[in-house]
């Protein structure tokens, strides 16, 4: 297993609709034809997998059906979007990139993106 540098933004603020997007960029030492991207969430020293996708030559990442993630790729950049976030989902989201093929296998883990989620205030009742 060889190490690889992965860069991602330090902080992202989710939209009022609970959507957060960030770019995960990896320094590929060669031309990988098969890449696996995993988003991990770290909160209270616990790490959980949020979503993962393996992609090849296309520009759209395909996630499992119950995934809250969507994404696209362009060169060595992956544009990730996480949806359905609530205040309790605030945490550090880490991008993990694996170059699956061709050998050698490379693994890179980013420093994480702190995503802040603020639940929208409920609209006050109106008399109109």
């Amino acid at each position: 297993c060889k190490a690889m540098h992965v860069a991602q933004p330090a902080v992202v603020l989710a939209s009022s609709r609970g959507i957060a997007s960030f770019v995960c960029e990896y320094a590929s030492p060669g031309k990988a034809t098969e890449v696996r991207v995993t988003v991990l969430r770290q909160a209270d020293s616990q790490v959980t997998e949020v979503c993962a996708a393996t992609y090849m030559m296309g520009n759209e990442l395909t996630f499992l059906d119950d995934s809250i993630c969507t994404g696209t790729s362009s060169g060595n950049q992956v544009n990730l979007t996480i949806q359905g976030l609530r205040a309790m989902d605030t945490g550090l989201y880490i991008c993990k990139v694996e170059l699956m093929y061709p050998p050698p296998y490379y693994l890179g883990i980013g420093n994480g993106t702190q995503i802040y989620v603020i639940d929208p205030e409920p609209c006050p009742d109106s008399d109109f």
Partner: antibody, heavy 115, light 106 residues
């Protein structure tokens, strides 16, 4: 030029298995997914699963999980789809298709399940 | 699973007509891809990533849309366009196709 050439038609008995091959040429086999698509007579298209020929990573449609197995042989640039426990509703044409965009397709393999 | 519903399922039109086929997704998808299939043949990629024409596809074909609503438009039907058209999504597994739209000669 890119080509996907599939094996010939099969007639199989209920409960048996069938293995369909898809030989790729004209491109780097390990650079693109190989997808498998079912089309029953007079019906639409149904994605069965895909394999990344380099690593062998597979994704399956749950409707076929447990009955379909996707494999590949990189030395011959050939992908295989094996379907087991066959029943009459498996009678269909099975296509292989290349990549994320399904930009090249095999000619199709007719599988008839009949006693 | 993401369901794709095409409308109409059947369409009768004449050479020279402008026709539009709609593909509605049960959940928002990033892109839609379109295929054409003629009887006894394998499907053929027409449009990928919603609006990009595949190699060799005539410019009378176009695609548009976003979110859950997508369309395929043929600006002026030619005799060779009479076929069945399918939309497809690959935002989430399993990849799914629409049920198809059969375009027939009026």
């Amino acid at each position: 030029q890119v080509q996907l050439v599939q094996s010939g038609a099969e007639v199989v008995k209920p409960g048996a298995s069938v293995k369909v091959s898809c030989k790729a040429s004209g491109y780097t086999f390990t650079s693109y997914w190989i997808n498998w698509v079912k089309q029953a007579p007079g019906q639409g298209l149904e994605w069965m699963g895909r394999i990344a020929p380099g690593s062998g990573t597979t994704y399956y449609n749950e409707m076929f999980t447990g009955r379909v197995t996707l494999t590949r042989d990189t030395s011959t640039s050939t992908a295989y789809m094996e379907l087991s426990s066959l029943r009459s509703e498996d009678t269909a044409v099975y296509f292989c298709a290349r990549g994320d965009y399904f930009d090249y397709w095999g000619q199709g393999t007719m599988v008839t399940v009949s006693s | 699973d993401i369901q794709l519903t095409q409308s109409p399922s059947f369409l009768s039109a004449s050479v020279g007509d402008r026709v539009t086929i709609t593909c509605s997704a049960s959940k928002s998808v990033s892109y839609i891809h379109w295929y054409q299939q003629k009887p006894g043949k394998a499907p053929k990629l027409l449009i990928y990533d919603t609006s990009t024409l595949a190699s060799g596809v005539p410019s009378r074909f176009s695609g548009s849309g976003s979110g859950t609503e997508y369309t395929l438009t043929i600006s002026s039907l030619q005799p060779e366009d009479f076929a069945t058209y399918y939309c497809q999504q690959r935002t989430t597994y399993p990849l799914t196709f629409g049920q198809g739209t059969k375009l027939e000669i009026k």
